[in-house]
Structures are given as C-alpha cells and as structure tokens.
Amino acid sequence: EINGSANYEMFIFHNGGVQILCKYPDIVQQFKMQLLKGGQILCDLTKTKGSGNTVSIKSLKFCHSQLSNNSVSFFLYNLDRSHANYYFCNLSIFDPPPFKVTLTGGYLHIYESQLCCQLK
Amino acid sequence: EINGSANYEMFIFHNGGVQILCKYPDIVQQFKMQLLKGGQILCDLTKTKGSGNTVSIKSLKFCHSQLSNNSVSFFLYNLDRSHANYYFCNLSIFDPPPFKVTLTGGYLHIYESQLCCQLK
C-alpha cells in the first residue's frame, strides 16, 4: 500500500551527490524513517524519547543523515547511473498516537550533469 | 544494530517450502513486522487498532503470512539454492510503549532434501 508521491521536492542535487528529503508532521515526537530503494532498505533512523524527555536517535542501517523538526534528509554520494530508481520514505509514527505507517516516494532520474565524476 | 540470533527454531520446512517464524511478545498490541532477506524487505505486516478496537492488518509488501497472538509466520515456496541467505525479523513495537525496534535472524541453509523439485 503506497500512499503516494511526495507532495514536495524530494531530491536535491549538489556536488555529485543527492539529498533525499523525507518529511514528517512536526507534531511527531517518536518515529522511524526508512529510506527504501525499490524494496531494499538503504538507510533508517529511529527517534525515541525516554523518561525526562531524553531523545535517542538510532540507526539499524546507517547513512549520513540530518534530522530537523519535520524532516529527515538522507545523503547519497558519488552518484552514478545505477542510483536511478524509485526511492521511498517509509515513515512509522509512534508518538503522539495513533500509530500510522505511510510510504511516499518518487523516481530519482540521473542526468549527465548530476553525475559525480563526468568524463571530460 | 542487530539484536541477535533468534533463540528459537526460526525455519520450519515442509513440502519444498519454508515457514519463517517471527516472534513477538504476546503483550504487544500494535506492531510492524518485516521479513528481510539480507537488507531487502521481502514481506511486511502491520497490525494496528482503530477506533472501537477494530484491528487492521496491512501489508506494504505482501507474502503469504499467518498471524498469531505472539508470532507472524511468513511462507516461502518453491525453494531453490538462491533462497539460502541471512533472514531477519525486523519488529517495531508501537503499543504498549515504549517504542522499540528489534532485529533477530539466522541463516537459511538449503539442503538437497529441502528443495522443491529434486532431480530424481
């Protein structure tokens, strides 16, 4: 069950790499975000809050990532044509409830100008 | 962060197929269980409770599965040697809190006697 295409610019290119933006509602305090390439888990990040509001960030599959109050950005480097694929942000919301799982995504097109090391 | 090998018999062979058993504590009411082959999501099942305690079972990646009050079984059929791999049960517990993610697994060995269609 795929909830749909991202309703925002999901891919931001810079310096032969790409930032993949996975948004979540900023009211959400505890969640898991997975980046899927096709059906494969590339990256994931889990944010939980313990007693005393201590925040814990964990990754089962680590990628360079950046967390804000309404998004997780995953960074892929050294782009080549094999990176072209469907990418999905798989969000599991845990707190505040209700528990909700959403999958949104888009196709990453790789053009010559975005490749890491273009042939001169 | 892999929590470890399954401390139970994870693979049950029958009729050229395999039942992969993914256990969860029977106190758990809402969860997501993914079956991973290596780093790839093969199957997943999410159990949530809606208003009026209605139970909802959803799959982003559907496999033949069976849900009990403390396990999810995923069934793979027509086994061949390419099925040999590490398989992981990736459990995300949502209710009751605290939110927790555990990954347990083991290696699926494929022996001649377990293949679907042995050469006579």
Partner: antibody, heavy 121, light 106 residues
C-alpha cells in the same frame, strides 16, 4: 460510536483557575492523542496544546505556556485541560479534539461539544 | 507564527451555486485542512491533507492548493452548507486556524 463528552459551563473570577474535562468513549483511549482548542466569542479558533495519552508527553502553544496544563486519566478515559491565572480575555468555548493522521499531516477528526468558560468579576 | 488569511470574510450565494473559499498562508505550508462550523456546534472536519474528503462528507466538497495558496470548493450549494469555514495548518508550530469565511444565503 466514537464520542468526546465535555464537562459543563463554568463561571470564574479573574486570577482563578478552571479545569475542563473530556471523557472519551467508543475507542481505546490510549491509542490516540488529545488536543485542546479554544474559541473566544465571535473569534476564530486557537490551538492550545495536546497530550499523548499513553506516554504523557505534552506539547503546548507557547502563548499559553506556564498557564495551561493538560493531563489524562487512563482509568476513566478522561483528558483534562487546566488554565490558571484567568483573565477576561480567556472567556471562550474550549474544545477537546482527537488527533489523527493523513498521509502528510495531522488533524482533529472528532471533537467534544465544547465547554463555555466565562471569566468575570 | 504562520498566519492564515481567509477570503472573502463573508460570501453570499444561493443554493445550487458554486462556492470558492480561499486561504492564504504567510509562509509555505505542506498541507491544509478545512473545517465547517455551524452556530452552537463544534467544528467538523471536511477536508484533510489539502484534498482528501473526510468520512461522511459529500463529494460536492473538494480542496486544492499548495505552498501558500489553498482553496475549498463547494460545487453546488445545498441549504445545509451555509456555515462558517475555517482552514487549519499543522505543519508549522504554533498550529493555526484562519479567521473563517462565513457562507450565507443570498
């Protein structure tokens, strides 16, 4: 069916406190968070804050920070909103609203009937 | 704080006519929700996630928009549609409502 039933109207003196209740039925109380929203006479709606019932985490609108306290009693499936140091401009209808999510955002899917609080000397 | 400005403040139309209500955000938001409120009643969810129809809401209601500009459309007004309509954004803290558009019978 899913219902949120709020306590009755209150008349309060400036400087005092008021505690409004919201009793949930028709669903598992801990499976959803609860928001509070208010509406002053002839005015628009204003989000005050929420409580995540099972974790007790709260999130308040900074405008009310320090004056509002949202709590919940799981045993009676009741959420509470207490507002202290009342002034005349706190005269409003106070609503509880249940949290829900779409694919992208969150919203209030079920509302209480409202509780009128009048602050007057 | 993200300010939501609804226009017009009052809209006078007859049953059967088409109503278009606007909501403009002071900065970009990811989605908009719409609520209907009748006198003496609590608000009722109409549209969530910009364009999704809430449970039990008739198909004559629709929502659209992105960024800072969002619209609620009622294709053919029924007598029970005359009420106050509020837009709401939950993508930027503190979460805010528009001041409302009153839809009245001409």
């Amino acid at each position: 069916q899913v219902q949120l039933v709020q306590s009755g109207a209150e008349v309060k003196k400036p400087g005092s406190s008021v505690k409004v209740s919201c009793k949930a039925s028709g669903y598992t109380f801990t499976d959803y968070a609860m928001h509070w929203v208010r509406q002053a006479p002839g005015q628009g709606l204003e989000w005050m804050g929420l409580i995540s019932i099972y974790s007790d985490h709260t999130n308040y609108n900074q405008k009310f920070q320090g004056r509002v306290t949202i709590t919940a009693d799981k045993s009676t499936s009741t959420a509470y909103m207490e507002l202290s140091s009342l002034r005349s401009e706190d005269t409003a209808v106070y609503y509880c609203g249940r949290n829900n999510y779409g694919n992208y955002g969150w919203y209030f899917d079920v509302w209480g009937q409202g509780t009128t609080v009048t602050v007057s000397s | 704080e993200i300010v939501l400005t609804q226009s017009p403040a009052t809209l006078s139309l007859s049953p059967g006519e088409r109503a278009t209500l606007s909501c403009s955000a002071s900065s970009s938001v990811s989605y908009m929700h719409w609520y209907q409120q009748k006198p003496g009643q609590a608000p009722r969810l109409l549209i969530y996630d910009t364009s999704k129809l809430a449970s039990g809401i008739p198909a004559r209601f629709s929502g659209s928009g992105s960024g800072t500009d969002y619209t609620l459309t009622i294709s053919s007004l029924e007598p029970e549609d005359f009420a106050v309509y509020y837009c709401f954004q939950g993508s930027g803290y503190p979460y805010t409502f528009g001041q409302g558009t009153k839809l009245e019978i001409k």
